[in-house]
């Protein structure tokens, strides 16, 4: 059956032979209606990439550099299955390219000019492409030929496989630049030995190199890693201090109509029958015909790449930056310390309008990028298409797990001028009901619920976390008879109450009328029994404070709060009747952009923040008539975080624990991708 066939692309006679053997052995173990293998032979990996894009083949396994080529237009391929190394219990699908230095040296990443460098080899990922790609714009001009520019940047190097005649400085630390183990400074161990012997000041290797060469922790403690933010960390903190995270070996397929489920079904069956130590007659991860045919011999198995993970996310911002710099050779005209404009991520078109207005008023210091969901915005910040946005705590958690950092906190209670330097305790997550109802926290089963959005703090993480510990399962859509929780599956009962309009029904953005704090309260007013919101929501939308038709006649006293002890209290008493304290919303950014984002935002709020009194004739950053566009409307200022500059420290141990517990109920495709 052609639609059940996976056309594997082979790049040599030996690979084609192994592919045929793979095909025949899979036929013998799979049912006739199961997936099958067909073999397509091409001259190179690049030809395979083109063949898959043209629907002449379906899959091929590629190194990271080729995954980058595969992702570029017009190929548009995506990673679907990753080889893993190490054990099944602790599978390694990535390695980290690092810059190792001796602890007793005192320079940072931005002070490498004039130092001596040790590389694994010319054109290799961790030893050359990544470090030189990231340093590319600091190299002296002309940057071509690249080897000459590198030779003029460092005061001496060992770059195995370089041309020692044309570029003697690249072979200064290893005469001849031998391209095999005859050169004592060749490859990973060699580059590390070059540093250890004192020949070089920095070695560009992979994170495991230092552990493979120094079994003793006391010896390892004599070394440190250089981080991209110009700090240093210990060698075991490579996950937080690396030049790039590099995928090892990856199966790619078309982004649309790519048969990824079929490819996974095939490879999953293949590893069951022919994986490590499974079969004598055919081995997936070795071959009598040669090394690394179809798959790496060192692989231990396959893992399915999460569907949300596109090539940009898979390769990572640092890796793509390095490779793009090397390939395209473009740099800003004068690399300065000046901050470039910050690209704000706006959610759907209401936020985009406000962002555009901000952009016009900021004299071009703010630019705007749009996405349809918060998770899509976070992904755009991760891959460099956007720089920053302000997030509810639930999404600060997801952003943090995806490598972003909190930059400034929204403050709601502290009056100026102390606001900017005050760390507030947070706001209260509350459950609001109509005063006329007889609901309590203990009899919510079967009622109609209104939520700000799935994954948000007051509207979801806190109430559902509490509910989970009561009911011990994740079927929240069965607990409530119906509800509106934007971001739920469209056919779920938790989308039934949403108002839309139609194509946007239950979407987690302002196009859904019941989205956000105000939307969830409106849902309660018009259809629901309980709304999970922040403690300020009722006062902010009653007594004529919200001029919209549905809200203008509402009275605060017609609503009450549910307390966890089964009692109810006035909306004026949230301190004595709340579900939990929630961390304030916070601005997040990539680490490399955090300082610029902070500087710019502090400047912008001085011009457009809460000191502006007349928002009818001036642009106001924290104003959107109860819609909470870009920032919460009740923001007084954006405040410095001081030492709360990681998502764990910012959110606090208790909240992180609560959200981590809820992860078993997670519907976040982005979180799944970021924790892959």
């Amino acid at each position: 059956v052609p639609e059940k066939s996976v056309r594997w692309c082979a790049v040599s006679e030996h690979e084609a032979t192994k592919c045929q053997s793979f095909r025949d052995h899979m036929k013998s173990v799979l049912p006739s209606n199961g997936p099958s293998v067909a073999c397509v032979k091409k001259a190179s990996h690049l030809d395979c990439i083109r063949a898959i894009a043209a629907n002449e083949a379906d899959a091929v396994t590629l190194d990271a550099g080729l995954v980058y080529d595969a992702y570029l237009a017009p190929n548009n391929l995506k990673p679907v299955v990753a080889e893993f190394y190490g054990s099944k219990e602790d599978p390694q699908t990535f390695y980290y390219a690092v810059a190792v230095v001796k602890k007793d040296s005192d320079f940072q990443m931005n002070q490498l000019r004039g130092r001596k460098s040790c590389h694994t080899g010319l054109g290799r990922s961790a030893g050359w492409n990544i470090p030189i790609g990231l340093l590319y714009c600091d190299l002296p001009e002309p940057r071509k030929p690249l080897e000459k520019a590198v030779a003029n940047f460092f005061s001496g190097s060992c770059v195995p496989c370089a041309d020692g005649t044309d570029f003697p400085q690249l072979c200064q630390l290893c005469p001849g630049c031998g391209c095999s183990t005859l050169n004592q400074y060749f490859s990973y161990s060699g580059a590390f030995k070059c540093l250890k012997d004192g020949a070089g000041d920095v070695a560009f290797v992979k994170h495991s190199t230092i552990f493979e060469n120094l079994a003793n922790k006391a010896d390892r403690d004599q070394y440190e890693l250089l981080c991209l933010d110009n700090t240093r960390k210990s060698v075991d903190e490579y996950k937080d201090c690396h030049l790039a995270r590099v995928p090892s070996h990856t199966v790619v397929a078309r982004s649309v109509g790519g048969k990824e489920d079929l490819i996974w079904e095939l490879l999953n069956q293949a590893q069951e029958h022919f994986g490590k130590d499974k079969s004598k007659e055919f081995q997936l991860f070795s071959s009598p015909h040669g090394k690394d045919l179809l798959f790496k011999d060192s692989a231990h198995g396959f893992l399915k790449v999460p569907p949300r993970m596109d090539a940009k996310m898979y390769l990572g911002y640092e890796y793509i930056t390095a490779i793009r710099n090397l390939r395209e050779g473009t740099c800003p005209e004068a690399p300065t310390d000046e901050c470039k404009p910050v690209k704000w991520c706006a959610l759907s078109h209401h936020e985009r309008l406000k962002c555009d207005e901000w952009s016009v008023n900021s004299a071009g210091k703010i630019e705007c990028e749009s996405a349809e969901t918060t998770e899509d915005c976070i992904a755009k910040i991760m891959n460099g298409e956007a720089d920053a946005m302000s997030l509810d705590g639930g999404f600060v958690y997801i952003a943090g797990m995806c490598g972003l950092v909190p930059v400034l906190a929204e403050n709601y209670n502290t009056p100026n001028p102390n606001c900017e330097n005050t760390a507030e305790e947070g706001y209260f997550a509350v459950a609001v009901v109509k005063s006329s109802s007889d609901l309590t926290w203990d009899n919510l089963k079967g009622k109609k619920s209104c939520h700000t959005a799935v994954g948000r703090t007051a509207g979801w993480n806190i109430p559902m976390g509490l509910l989970y510990s009561k009911i011990n399962h994740c079927r929240f859509d069965e607990f409530f008879s119906e509800g509106c929780a934007p971001g739920s599956e469209k056919n779920s009962s938790l989308c039934k109450l949403c108002m839309g309009p139609s194509p946007n029904l239950c979407e987690p953005n302002n196009k859904e009328g019941y989205y956000g704090y105000t939307g969830a309260f409106r849902c309660l007013v018009e259809k629901g029994d309980v709304a999970f919101v922040k403690h300020q929501t009722v006062p902010q939308n009653t007594g004529g404070k919200n001029p919209d038709a549905w809200a203008k006649n509402l009275k605060e006293e017609d609503y009450e709060l549910l307390c966890l002890d089964g009692s109810r209290k006035s909306v004026q008493e949230p301190a004595n009747c709340h579900l939990a304290r929630a961390p304030n919303h916070a601005v997040v950014a990539r680490k490399d952009k955090a300082d610029c984002v902070q500087t710019l935002l502090l400047d912008q709020q001085r011009m457009f923040g809460s000191s502006v009194t007349d928002c009818s004739s001036n642009f106001c950053l924290f104003e959107s008539k109860t819609k909470d566009l870009l920032f919460r409307d009740d923001t007084v200022c954006l405040a410095k975080l001081h030492d709360r500059n990681t998502y764990e420290k910012y959110l606090g141990e208790e909240y992180v624990k609560a959200v981590t517990n809820l992860r078993k109920c997670s519907t976040s495709p982005l979180l799944e991708a970021c924790t892959f």
Epitope: H350, L353, E357, V360, A363, C615, S617, E623, S624, K625
Partner: nanobody
């Protein structure tokens, strides 16, 4: 809310010029920001140019150096002078006052600009 009515569009050859006007039904003197957007078939509506009450301007990269936005508060009118027009400038053009901080989708009829030989 205040009505905004666009005019001045039409068919023009590549390299030609047009001047769009947008007249407001109420005073624009105290409006913080006004802007021109455009929407080509099958595309998202995009910001072309914006102007603040104080006269600061911002332009999309694709129109910089060719288009000029201005406002005449006495006449309650926003203008867009478009020179060196290109086929890719073909779109429906809209003006907005950002619904004065409400950010609602209050768009007028817009005005068609077609650049073709």
């Amino acid at each position: 809310h205040v009505q905004l009515v666009e005019s001045g569009g039409g068919l023009v050859q590549p390299g030609g010029s047009l001047r769009l006007s947008c007249v407001a039904s109420g005073s624009i003197a105290s409006v913080a920001t006004m802007a021109w957007y455009r929407q080509a078939p099958g595309q998202q509506r995009e910001l072309v140019a914006g102007i603040t009450r104080g006269g600061s301007t911002k332009y999309a990269d694709s129109v910089k150096g060719r288009f000029t936005i201005s406002r005449d508060n006495a006449k309650n009118t926003l203008y867009l002078q478009m020179n060196s027009l290109k086929p890719e400038d073909t779109a429906v053009y809209y003006c907005t006052d950002y619904s004065r901080g409400y950010y609602q989708d209050y768009w007028g009829q817009g005005i068609q600009v077609t650049v073709s030989s």
